[in-house]
Every structure is written in structure tokens, then in C-alpha cells.
């Protein structure tokens, strides 16, 4: 049953709650069989996903999976938003679900939002 389709394992309605000023690695888990596809990150601006050029990215290899990583060094308040990775494979584009970064600006926040708060924010975002 194992297919050789490229898979990007980012779940629908996934999110990360992070703080401005911290380093952060946004991972796109990539499954492929023979040749590793070319993978890129983009940031959603409305319905358009704007390709992130000139950003620090890297690959991490694990047993049966590779991770294409977008580095935030450090996280900025403007990094708040939704991101998507896409793979170019055999002239086809495979797109992931979007994953949302909720950036808390340490200057204006006294405490980290709870997981329930994040979930309800996401529910509003996707409903």
C-alpha cells in the first residue's frame, strides 16, 4: 500500500505559538522515494502565497523522512501569519496545508496564550 507519491506532512489547522526574539525552526516533513524534490516555503497574503526568497533554509534527514526547515533567527512580530511549503516533483507542484505562527511580542504580552485560546483562534480562522 506504500505509494511513492511525495507527501508533505503538515496537518490542516496546525499552528505554533512562539515569542518574538526567540529562534524558531518551521519544519516541513517531506516523504519521497527516490529523488528528493525541490521544496520552497511561502507566506500567505490573503489567498496568495508569496514565495520566501533569500531566507535561511536547510534540510534535516531522518530515517524515512526529510525535513525542509525555515529558520527564524530571531522571530519578529511581522512573522505572525500562515505559511505553506510546496514541493516540485516531476513537474507537478504538491502543496501542503498551511500552518499558522502566532507570534507574541514579549514587550506587549505578560503570558503565553493557552492551547484552548489558540484552538479557538484557529477555529475562527478556518470557519
Amino acid at each position: 500500500k506504500e505509494s511513492c507519491d511525495v507527501q508533505l506532512y503538515i496537518k490542516r489547522q496546525s499552528y505554533h505559538s512562539i515569542f518574538a526574539g526567540d529562534p524558531f525552526k518551521l519544519e516541513c516533513p517531506v516523504k519521497y522515494c527516490a529523488h528528493r524534490p525541490q521544496v520552497t516555503w511561502c507566506k500567505l497574503n490573503g489567498t496568495t502565497c508569496v514565495k520566501l526568497e533569500g531566507r535561511h533554509t536547510s534540510w534535516k534527514q531522518e530515517k524515512n523522512l526529510s525535513f525542509f526547515i525555515l529558520h527564524f533567527e530571531p522571530v519578529l512580530p511581522s512573522d505572525n501569519g500562515s505559511y505553506r511549503c510546496s514541493a516540485n516533483f516531476l513537474s507537478a507542484i504538491i502543496e501542503s496545508h498551511s500552518t499558522t505562527l502566532y507570534v507574541t511580542d514579549v514587550k506587549s504580552a505578560s503570558e503565553r496564550p493557552s492551547k484552548d485560546e489558540m484552538a479557538s483562534r484557529l477555529w475562527l480562522l478556518y470557519s
Partner: antibody
Amino acid sequence: QVTLKESGPGILQPSQTLSLTCSFSGFSLSTFGMGVSWIRQPSGKGLEWLAHIYWDDDKRFNPSLKSRLSISKDTSNNQVFLKITTVDTADTATYYCARGNWDGETYFDYWGQGTTLTVSS
Amino acid sequence: DVVMTQSPLTLSVTIGQPASISCKSTQSLLDSDGKTYLNWLLQRPGQSPKSLIYLVSKLDSGVPDRFTGSGSGTDFTLKISRVEAEDLGVYYCWQGTHFPWTFGGGTKLEIK
């Protein structure tokens, strides 16, 4: 060979808590892309999705029941658990667990045989 | 929630003849990743559901090629080119594009 098998109490009284176990083999819930859902079916009626747990312990719930549901997993023993609090006669149904396979997102490619719950006073 | 409506409710077919089931959703099932998460299941009498088709038209393993799925957006169809006795049961479409995942009410296929 992938198999899933549900087990539960069979009969409960209203206001009790339902605890269900899904024991599976043939795959690992630590593998990227894998997940398990719970779905129920009142006798002679259609299917209702309840909850899903992903490989990384991320969870999704049907909002109509979310306040009463909890889902968890024991990866090393190949088990997934569902709890429904304060059951009522409307929760009488056959409860299925199903493997969520990944092709860009989940679809249910294998189902258990189901376990029947009757809620009666 | 996305409501899935199937028609007909019951389908009575002679063995060897074709059959067609319609499934309509109240919202488009085309996801932002370009895929359409519309799936079909068969529940034979007294059994648990079995996966037939996922992503509109991909046949699950072991499913005979007399089954075909088609459609886009909000309108989908399951076709059986030549019905066999083992095909009787209730067919369900379900969507995995929007949470909560939802199922159609089912179409009962009877053998004439």
C-alpha cells in the same frame, strides 16, 4: 496486515462515562501520516465522526460533542482510547475506530468491527 | 458543518447492469492545497464500513476497477460499471476538507 478492534462496556446508565479502547496491529501510530479516528453509528442510521488523534498526539474533535470528548493514545501498546462523559440514550450506537492514512490529509482506509453501546436506565 | 446529501436513497439494480450514486456538498470540497478530500465507503449488511475511493477518484487497494469516482467542487458521483452480488450494501460519501469531517446519509444498493 492492518487490523483494528474496539472494546467497550456494552451497557451504561445515563450520566456515566463511556471508555472505549481501540487495539490495532499492522501499523505504528508513531509513523508520520498515521492517525486513528472514532466514528459512531446509531442502529439503522448514518455515520458521525467524533474525534481523531494524529501521530504527533495532535487531536481534532467534532465541535458538537467536544466538551464531552477526550482522545488519547498508547503508542507502545498500539492502542487509542476515547472517553465520552455524561452519556445519554442518544449515545446508543455502534462505535468504530478507523485508521487515518495520509494522502495530503487523512482518509479512513481500515475500520474495526465496531463495539455496541446501549445507554439505558 | 458541511452537509453531504446523497441520492437516491435506495437503488435497485439488476446484476450486470450499471449503477450511479450522487453526492452533493453544501460547500466546495476543493482544499487550498489543490486536493479534493471526497471519499466513498461501502458498508455491507452486518459489517463495518470499507474504504472504496479517496480523493474523488483514487481506488483503494483491492477495490475492483468497475468502481469509478468523479466530480469536483460540490458535485460528485460514484459509478459501478457492472453490479455484482457482492456490491450490495449502503454506500456513503464523506468529506475530509472541512472540520468536522461529515458523512452523507447513505445510499442503499439492492439487487433486483
